[in-house]
Interface confidence: low
């Protein structure tokens, strides 16, 4: 099943997030992703746990997953590079870089997103945008078009309360509020964008969604700048 959903959001403006990628398994949406360079998409390492021997591809330039759109293009994946420290049973280091079979054809609907290199926390309360093609309600309805939601960043101390994530949120992770509006398992790999800059990647760990006591967890890209640069080099 696809990993992910946007709960309590709305349909995004078509092609207004040209960095947005759909990571696909055997032609079906699996995870979100974000174009960070002409030939590289950043996603979540756990996304590929479901892939087995299936064909992984990346769809760029899309708003609708099914309808013909002039900017849409499906790319084969030349190389999948999960973070070397990612493990199936933890949410730590949940990053994956996918090298496309060729450089993406850039245009108004396909463009890399600048990512944060300064390793400091986003201020609590900052509104950040998260987008994805995951299911949109608890009944499991899957959207055909890209959805998004604005979420306030939650401070780490609150997120680490015993009633919340009980100390699991390291300095390399960040949280956003999840009171009925939330990202969830399957928007995994998608971007958390604050002030037009990629700050986080939706983690693909299993958790309840839309519950204010279980905030959304995001991998802080700035904390992995050295690794990202080393792979893209």
């Amino acid at each position: 099943p696809p990993r992910g959903r946007i709960l309590g959001g709305r349909e995004a403006e078509a092609h207004a997030r040209p960095y947005m990628a759909s990571v696909q398994l055997n032609g079906a949406h699996l995870c979100g992703g974000v174009l960070v360079a002409e030939q590289w998409v950043l996603s979540a390492a756990h996304c590929l746990e479901d892939a087995a021997d299936g064909k992984v591809q990346v769809l760029l330039g899309a708003h609708s997953l099914s309808q013909p759109e002039p900017s849409k293009r499906l790319y084969d994946v030349l190389r999948a590079v999960p973070h070397p420290d990612s493990q199936p049973d933890t949410i730590d280091h949940d990053l994956l870089l996918l090298q496309l079979s060729e450089k993406a054809t850039l245009g108004p609907a396909v463009r890399p997103l600048p990512w944060q290199r300064v390793d400091r926390d986003v201020a609590p309360g900052t509104l950040c945008d998260v987008a994805g093609w995951g299911i949109v309600n608890h009944a499991g309805r899957r959207p055909d078009s890209l959805q998004h939601v604005l979420l306030p960043v939650l401070d780490r101390a609150t997120c680490n309360r015993r009633t919340h994530h009980d100390g699991a949120i390291t300095e390399r992770l960040m949280c956003a509020e999840s009171n009925r509006r939330d990202s969830c398992k399957g928007d995994s790999g998608g971007p958390l964008v604050c002030g037009g800059v990629l700050e986080g990647v939706v983690t693909s760990g299993s958790r309840v969604c839309g519950n204010r006591k279980k905030p959304g967890i995001y991998t802080r890209v700035a904390s992995y700048a050295a690794w990202i640069d080393s792979v893209l080099a």
Epitope: Q24, N26, G27, A28, P68, L74, D76, G107, P108, A109
Partner: antibody
Framework: QVQLQQSAAELARPGASVKMSCKAS????????VHWVKQRPGQGLEWIGY????????DYNQKFKDKTTLTADISSSTAYIQLSSLTSEDSAVYYC????????????WGQGTLVTVSA | NIMMTQSPSSLAVSAGEKVTMSCKSS????????????LAWYQQKPGQSPQLLIY???TRESGVPERFTGSGSGTDFTLTISSVQAEDLAVYYC????????FGGGTKLEIK
């Protein structure tokens, strides 16, 4: 180089069904949608629909939705079009086509398959 | 669906003459985000498959002779052959690919 090789001409009775093929070579079959276009004798071109071989997703021109079934076999890099409940209106040349590398004009065409419906 | 209308339906010219044919779309095929016209022209010679001539309304496909020129924007487009050759005998179709895919009815070019 990219090639789309279509099956031989078909003669069919009214009410019958016919299935034509389009074998792709020279590129990765699952990376591009395969489109089908109809051309009645002495007439213009009509877009029927397409299939995404990697997912099986199909999109049809509403006019042909009930008449046509598009399928694909990845193992043989072949796309198929099946026409059902044939009438004389279905007598035509059917082309498969593939878009260009980045955009949706039709850069590559099969040679066409002529279907003749006759009692 | 966007409707495409071509005119004339047929025309006959002598070799060496200049010829123009028209294609009109029922709504604009100019995509505002990239300022490109999503319009192509094809040539179909007798007994053959269509061949791509022009895309983006005015960009010649590789190998297409310079005598073929596409122009226009929005809803009105023209294909011009500056000096018709005997081998240009064909039907010419315009095609929009902005919203699904539709073709014009074609213009048949005959050589006197």
């Amino acid at each position: 180089q990219v090639q789309l090789q279509q099956s031989a001409a078909e003669l069919a009775r009214p009410g019958a069904s016919v299935k034509m093929s389009c074998k792709a070579s020279g590129y990765t079959f699952t990376s591009y949608t395969v489109h089908w276009v109809k051309q009645r004798p002495g007439q213009g071109l009509e877009w029927i629909g397409y299939i995404n071989p990697s997912s099986g997703f199909t999109d049809y021109n509403q006019k042909f939705k009930d008449k046509t079934t598009l399928t694909a076999d990845i193992s043989s890099s072949t796309a198929y079009i099946q026409l059902s409940s044939l009438t004389s209106e279905d007598s035509a040349v059917y082309y498969c086509a593939r878009r260009g590398v980045n955009w949706s004009w039709f850069a590559y065409w099969g040679q066409g398959t002529l279907v003749t419906v006759s009692a | 669906n966007i409707m495409m209308t071509q005119s004339p339906s047929s025309l006959a010219v002598s070799a060496g003459e200049k010829v123009t044919m028209s294609c009109k779309s029922s709504q604009s095929v100019l995509y505002s985000s990239n300022q490109k016209n999503y319009l192509a022209w094809y040539q179909q010679k007798p007994g053959q498959s269509p061949q791509l001539l022009i895309y983006w309304a005015s960009t010649r496909e590789s190998g297409v002779p310079e005598r073929f020129t596409g122009s226009g924007s929005g809803t009105d487009f023209t294909l011009t052959i500056s000096s018709v050759q005997a081998e240009d005998l064909a039907v010419y179709y315009c095609h929009q690919y902005l919203s699904s895919w539709t073709f014009g009815g074609g213009t048949k070019l005959e050589i006197k």
